[in-house]
């Protein structure tokens, strides 16, 4: 696994411990919490990052209406089970044997049950809607400039292929970023939209996961973009299975 060989660190994940004992005596970086080796040339999966985080703590609108099936992640943090590739396992349980099914972003998509609950597959989240509210500015940002800057950010900082950022909507002071990625579109080396969204979310909150990098500093034509509030909606390839029909808090 690649890492900065000279001083054996992981540029893309500060929640790691690196040592020169990998294959061939190379630098190997292990995610805290799970101990799994991570590829430091790309983003670490959200599941491993959440596990590491838990271990470290233990009408003319241009805006999109979230689908009735969109899930808003309100459950907060939990210590997830990751598979052998570092992705979320379909079924997650807590210490008290309460279990639930999650999507590929790790957000609950069913009612909670007991250990008899079955989750047949990890349902893929193919559409992520990131909604930001920016601090008041003297004048609204130019939509085209904002679009370009956010696309550049996702491509350069998060290594997300441009085709997966499908749209940037803007209605002052609300910005919406749409990420779309079907399983068939995602190549082996492509960053998952789930991971890009999570890194972006942590950046926005001033909790950057990148090693030694300053927090996010987005400027649109020299004007800093300060985010006051963030909401992220997740739309799965199959509707969530909650007992009440509502815009579900996941």
């Amino acid at each position: 696994h690649t890492a900065a060989q000279d001083n054996c660190t992981c540029p893309t994940n500060k929640m790691t411990v690196c040592s020169p004992d990998g294959p061939g005596g190379r630098c190997q970086c292990r995610a805290l919490g799970s101990g799994m080796a991570v590829d430091c040339s790309t983003l670490t999966s959200k599941c491993l990052l959440l596990k590491a985080r838990m271990s470290a703590r233990k009408s003319g609108r241009s805006l999109v209406m979230p689908s009735e099936h969109a899930i808003l992640d309100n459950d907060g943090l939990y210590d997830p089970e990751c598979d052998d590739k570092g992705r979320f396992k379909a079924r997650q349980c807590n210490q008290t044997s309460v279990c639930w099914c999650v999507n590929s972003v790790g957000v609950r998509r069913t009612d909670k049950g007991d250990q008899s609950l079955r989750c047949d597959e990890v349902v893929r989240t193919h559409h992520i809607l990131i909604e930001l509210r920016h601090r008041p500015t003297d004048r609204a940002f130019n939509h085209s400039d904002l679009d370009s800057e956010l696309r550049r950010l996702f491509q350069e900082r998060y290594k997300l292929h441009p085709s997966f950022l499908s749209a940037v909507h803007y209605e002052e002071p609300t910005i919406q970023i749409e990420l779309r990625q079907n399983a068939s579109q995602k190549g082996l080396r492509d960053v998952d939209i789930a991971d890009a969204a999570y890194y972006f979310e942590r950046d926005i909150k001033g909790e950057s996961l990148f090693m030694g990098r300053r927090g996010l500093d987005v400027q649109v034509r020299g004007e800093p973009l300060h985010v006051e509030r963030t909401l992220i909606y997740y739309l799965d390839e199959k509707p969530p299975q909650f007992s009440m029909k509502r815009l579900t808090a996941g």
Partner: antibody
Amino acid sequence: QVQLQQPGSELVRPGASVKLSCKASGYTFTSYWMHWVKQRHGQGLEWIGNIYPGGGYTNYDEKFKSKGTLTVDTSSSTAYMHLSSLTSEDSAVYYCTRSSVFDYWGQGTTLTVSS
Amino acid sequence: DILLTQSPAILSVSPGERVSFSCRASQNIGTSIHWFQQRTNGSPRLLIKYASESISGIPSRFSGSGSGTDFTLSINSVESEDIADYYCQQSNSWPFTFGSGTKLEIK
């Protein structure tokens, strides 16, 4: 050359505690994980846990979480394992071993818990 | 936790024979498997790391292969000094685990 030095034996009473040591030399102590392994007489090897001296990060196998505590003293390049509430089940040889591939091992400390 | 199953429990061979030890993991662990030899009253000694990488000072008759879930340690011409217990160990994720071991006996 890399060396991990452990005391040969420890005799303690049931219910007591013990602190086993492992003094490292011949490499940069803070750059490699240190692991502890238990082996009861005639039995196989069991991983207890590990510690990263460069940051103090620790991990434990579930069955040893309430039994052992791993610490390091970087100034003397020494790793320690504190074992508490000892019973005869804790009588075993305890090894310290370096890095994720366990490339160097101490000679092991034979812990005997007996009244 | 990742379970490592070693087979057989005991291997009995004649000097000069080729012998193979098997280790099977309960899930895909890539090549994060290492092999150890432990002689009577001795500390374990690393023979092979990352499934197939040789170790300085270890005789060339020892070799390893495999990836994913199935791994093999081979001794291409057994010598009497090879009488020992052999363990596989995974470093894919915590908790690290060992196989139960295979005892090598000489006929």
